[in-house]
């Protein structure tokens, strides 16, 4: 029977009594930055090239000693579950290691730099095809160590790391922070996340997805053919780097954002407890568990869409929050939300020739997260429609009045304190799909989008009576890249997209009252590309 | 996952114009920051990276880093060059006391400057 | 699924020796530590003895320490436990079991992570009388 | 040597009775603690792991609680497959002891 983990992220389709995928990434190779490995373990022997760089501390304490199966042991357990013969993901994946943690498994941030331009510069030296650098090893927030990472990544390096093991938000950890690396949380055989002693897996909005990260049965240092279960989310990084592998051997040409993306598309959506996370929490962290794509072709067609949301801007009445997408992605729309329900609202706004997504919080209110949705649109025309505050009964309203353009996301903003208390709520005149409406006292903006192909639909579900949550959610074959609420009322806590889903929250129902005032609509607009689709018929 | 995290220290050293009379002074309003871990244990005092501006060439930064060690040895402290980082970001990985910080801000290019500190197996 | 079958006992005198053994299916056998658990006629459960993965560690309950032997063959995916100087109560069932467990880093170092003897064999029976 | 003490040696309950079995160590073991379910001719079967963490393919009505020297398992609500002998095992620097089991048998 093949390991719990490699059944967790294997497809039903190529599920077999042995997990043989088919191309297991024999066109990438994976950095390693770890400890040292045992490179002649059967499991990697003959895939795993250990290079000639070690920035390694001295270990602690007087009494510590040098035994060779104890410094492998971490280094010799990831290469083996991300290429191992018996227990890998990517049993095809080339593997290179760099030795940057201690017998101890410490290492230092100049070190990791170090290793990391190490990497770049043998890239510029000898260019290979796509690689990926799994990072299984955390700091504090390091500036330097993200920055370092975003460069590489822009570079054309997929970068993936462990969220870290501390029980704790991952956006305090490097390189755990930086957002242009994929970081992993660890979940268990019951799609549980990890506990690790008194510890256990991080998450937060920092965490890109989960992964298989306690039990692993991989490599042991302890002998050639020894196996040993390890737990940790440096496993998880190694299972998504595996897949990564996997992925881009069958499609080389995908960019860092373009496999973000499917790894997102294909994970297992809404598996995890989220009781185990805290409450605070709960709503930033995604609930996604990595798997391979059912099929290694064809998902091109799609349009791929994911949620970012921001740091937190923080009680003051001026703050403000801002989310941002890759450079490769377009921002469909912008959303807002805040635990209080004092905001001002969203706008999406131009910052360095792109668009971002700006919150505003409210005074009195304890702050607001900013929610972008990041789409891949190619040949995408993107532009910003707004509408000052109307004065006038029927509230305010923009539409996307270019010739082709399609509205993909509605946002509003107000800079009254209280939106609309004792007004009536404004409701959408029914056969207008491509326009925005909101309260009169708040300026609308309508991000409106050009692409070839690309058409958008609005749904809505509204509930009469007040609820702590109204969801709306596109129908199979359309992606959700708006996501509102119908009114822009105080009650409403704020909206955000989970997965293809619009979730729009309120305030406790207890606290609210039920007036017509609990009226609350979800608004999503949901759009696909014919244009994808056509592409990749063609393709096949 | 932002660069504006806040919960990391960051420590912003004020220049002022000293004794030095550097040839190449920062640029008017821009203020290099010095950066460390929040969490205390893992710190390294006394290695730091500093970090250059943007298209800073190799060759500066290897004059920037002599210029430090030279206006250190003046100080009568000891440096030490460990690395000079090009490829990725331009800087070096110097070896000195604390107390030579707001010195270092004040070279020409750099961006900021953040001190070592632990990484461990996840 | 992950079986374990034990074979190896039977009557022995006082004094004597028998060998047990344990036959484990795939390499999740030789992941963990395995341990070898007994129970005499109508009694509870005793533990034995257990060993690491690569046989470098082997430990044993006080009552049989010098007279047993726990060992294991990993390109065989067996365990064994050899039992000399064999004592009336030795009479028991025993059982082999699949220590789970799982290392994790933190603190400059592994620690283990204990779940218990999660697959047990179905029993051999050691009989000793003369 | 860690002793483990199960009480009560003998337990008499009805289907749909909540059911109680507690297990102390003669000292702390963290919750480095196992709870095993037996039938009469059959090998023992994990019910709880680390004190309170469920095994998995083990019914919800079983829970475990406890940390230190005091464990406690506790079936919620008894069902006819429940009754059997059930035992406690410490886990202490790779060497176990379990306690001398409980007979949990039909009133």
């Known amino acids: 029977s093949i390991p719990w983990n490699l059944e967790r992220i294997t497809p039903p389709r190529y599920r077999a009594d042995e997990y043989q995928p088919p191309d297991g990434g024999s066109l990438v190779e994976v950095y390693l930055l770890d400890t040292s490995i045992q490179s002649d373990h059967r499991e990697i022997e003959g895939r795993v090239m250990v290079t000639d760089f070690e920035n390694v501390p001295e270990e602690d304490g007087t009494r510590f000693h040098r035994q060779a199966s104890k410094c492998d042991s971490h280094g010799t357990h990831l290469a083996g579950v991300v290429s191992g013969r018996d227990a890998g993901v990517a049993k095809g994946a080339s593997m290179r290691s760099l030795r940057v943690l201690n017998c101890q498994g410490k290492g230092t941030v100049s070190g990791t730099l170090i290793g990391l331009e190490f990497i770049r510069k043998s890239q510029l030296v000898q260019p290979v095809g796509p690689l990926v650098v799994l990072l299984p090893l955390a700091g504090g927030y390091s500036r330097v160590l993200n920055a370092a990472c975003q460069r590489l990544a822009r570079a054309g390096v997929v970068l993936v790391t462990a969220a870290g093991n501390f029980r704790d938000d991952a956006c305090l950890y490097s390189p755990a922070s930086a957002p242009e690396v994929i970081t992993v949380g660890a979940t268990n055989a019951q799609d549980q996340p990890v506990t690790l002693g008194t510890l256990g897996t991080n998450f937060g909005r920092c965490v890109d997805l989960f992964a298989p990260g306690e039990d692993i049965i991989g490599a042991s240092s302890d002998c050639s053919t020894c196996f040993v279960s390890q737990s940790g989310t440096s496993q998880a990084a190694a299972h998504v780097a595996g897949i990564a592998a996997m992925m881009l051997s069958a499609e080389p040409e995908l960019t860092l954002a373009e496999l973000r993306q499917r790894l997102i598309h294909f994970s297992a959506k809404d598996v995890i407890n989220e009781a185990w996370f805290p409450e605070d929490q709960r709503v930033l962290t995604p609930n996604l568990v990595a798997a391979l794509p059912p099929s290694t072709h064809g998902a091109g067609w799609q349009l791929f869409c994911r949620t970012v949301w921001s740091a937190h801007s923080g009680p003051t009445r001026m703050a403000t929050a801002v989310a941002r997408c890759a450079p490769d992605e377009e921002l469909l729309s912008c959303s807002s939300f805040s635990r209080s329900g004092k905001r001002r609202g969203e706008r999406m706004e131009a910052q360095g020739g792109k668009l971002v997504c700006r919150a505003h919080n409210a005074f009195g209110g304890e702050g607001v997260y900013a929610i972008a949705r990041c789409c891949l649109l190619p040949q995408a025309n993107c532009s910003v429609h707004t509408a000052p505050p109307a004065e006038a009964s029927m509230g305010t309203r923009v539409h996307c009045h270019q010739q082709g353009h399609v509205l993909t996301g509605c946002s509003s903003h107000w800079e009254v304190e209280d939106l609309g208390t004792h007004k009536p709520p404004v409701l959408r005149p029914r056969g207008q799909p491509n326009q925005c409406v909101g309260h009169r006292e708040a300026s609308i903006h309508a991000s409106c989008c050009h692409a070839p192909g690309l058409e958008c639909k609005v749904k809505e579900h509204g509930i009469p009576a007040p609820q702590e949550q109204v969801t709306v959610a596109c129908e199979e074959g359309w992606t959700l890249t708006g996501c509102s609420a119908l009114p822009g009322t105080s009650h409403v806590l704020g909206a955000y997209a989970v997965d293809n889903t619009c979730v729009v929250r309120s305030r406790d129902v207890s606290t609210t009252g039920s007036t017509s005032e609990g009226a609350v609509t979800a608004v999503a607009i949901c759009c696909r590309s014919r244009h994808l689709a056509q592409a990749s018929q063609e393709l096949q | 996952q932002e660069d504006e995290d806040g919960d990391y220290e960051e420590l912003v050293l004020a220049l002022r114009s000293e004794e030095d009379g550097l040839a190449e002074a920062p640029e008017h309003g821009t203020t290099a920051t010095f950066h460390r871990c929040a969490k205390d244990p893992w710190r390294l005092p006394g290695t730091y990276v500093v970090v250059l501006k943007e298209e800073t060439h190799l060759s500066q930064s290897e004059r920037t880093a002599r210029r430090l060690q030279a206006q250190a040895a003046r100080r009568g402290y000891l440096t030490k060059i460990l690395h000079v980082f090009h490829g990725l970001l331009p800087g070096f990985l110097v070896k000195m006391s604390g107390d030579l910080l707001e010195l270092a801000l004040k070279l020409p290019h750099v961006d900021y400057i953040e001190e070592d500190s632990s990484v461990f197996a996840q | 699924e992950v079986q374990l079958v034990e074979s190896g006992g039977g009557l022995v005198q006082p004094g004597g020796s028998l060998r047990l053994s344990c036959a484990a299916s795939?390499?999740?056998?030789?992941?963990?530590?395995m341990s070898w658990v007994r129970q005499a006629p109508g009694k509870g459960l005793e533990w034995v003895a257990n060993i690491k993965q690569d046989g470098s560690e082997k430990y044993y309950v006080d009552s049989v320490k010098g007279r047993f032997t726990i060992s294991r063959d990993i390109a065989k995916n067996s365990l064994y436990l050899q039992m000399n100087s064999l004592r009336a109560e030795d009479t028991a069932v025993y059982y082999c079991?699949?220590?789970?467990?799982?290392?994790?880093?933190?603190?400059?170092?592994?620690?283990?992570?204990?779940?218990?003897?999660?697959?047990w064999g179905q029993g051999t029976t050691v009989t000793v009388s003369s | 040597d860690i002793q483990m003490t199960q009480s009560p040696s003998t337990l008499s309950a009805s289907v749909g009775d909540r059911v109680t079995i507690t297990c102390r160590a003669s000292?702390?073991?963290?919750?480095?603690l196992a709870w095993y379910q037996q039938k009469p001719g059959k090998a023992p079967k994990l019910l709880i792991y680390?004190?309170?963490s469920l095994e998995s393919g083990v019914p919800s009505r079983f829970s475990g609680s406890g940390s230190g020297t005091e464990f406690t398992l506790t079936i919620s609500s008894l069902q006819p497959d429940d009754f059997a002998t059930y035992y406690c095992?410490?886990?202490?620097?790779?060497?176990?002891?379990f306690g001398q089991g409980t007979k949990l048998e039909i009133k």
């Open positions: 680390k004190a309170s």
């Open positions: 079991a699949r220590d789970r467990g799982t290392y994790y880093y933190a603190d400059g170092g592994y620690n283990y992570y204990y779940y218990g003897m999660d697959v």
């Open positions: 095992q410490q886990y202490n620097s790779y060497s176990y002891t």
């Open positions: 000292q702390s073991i963290s919750s480095w």
């Open positions: 795939g390499i999740t056998f030789s992941s963990y530590w």
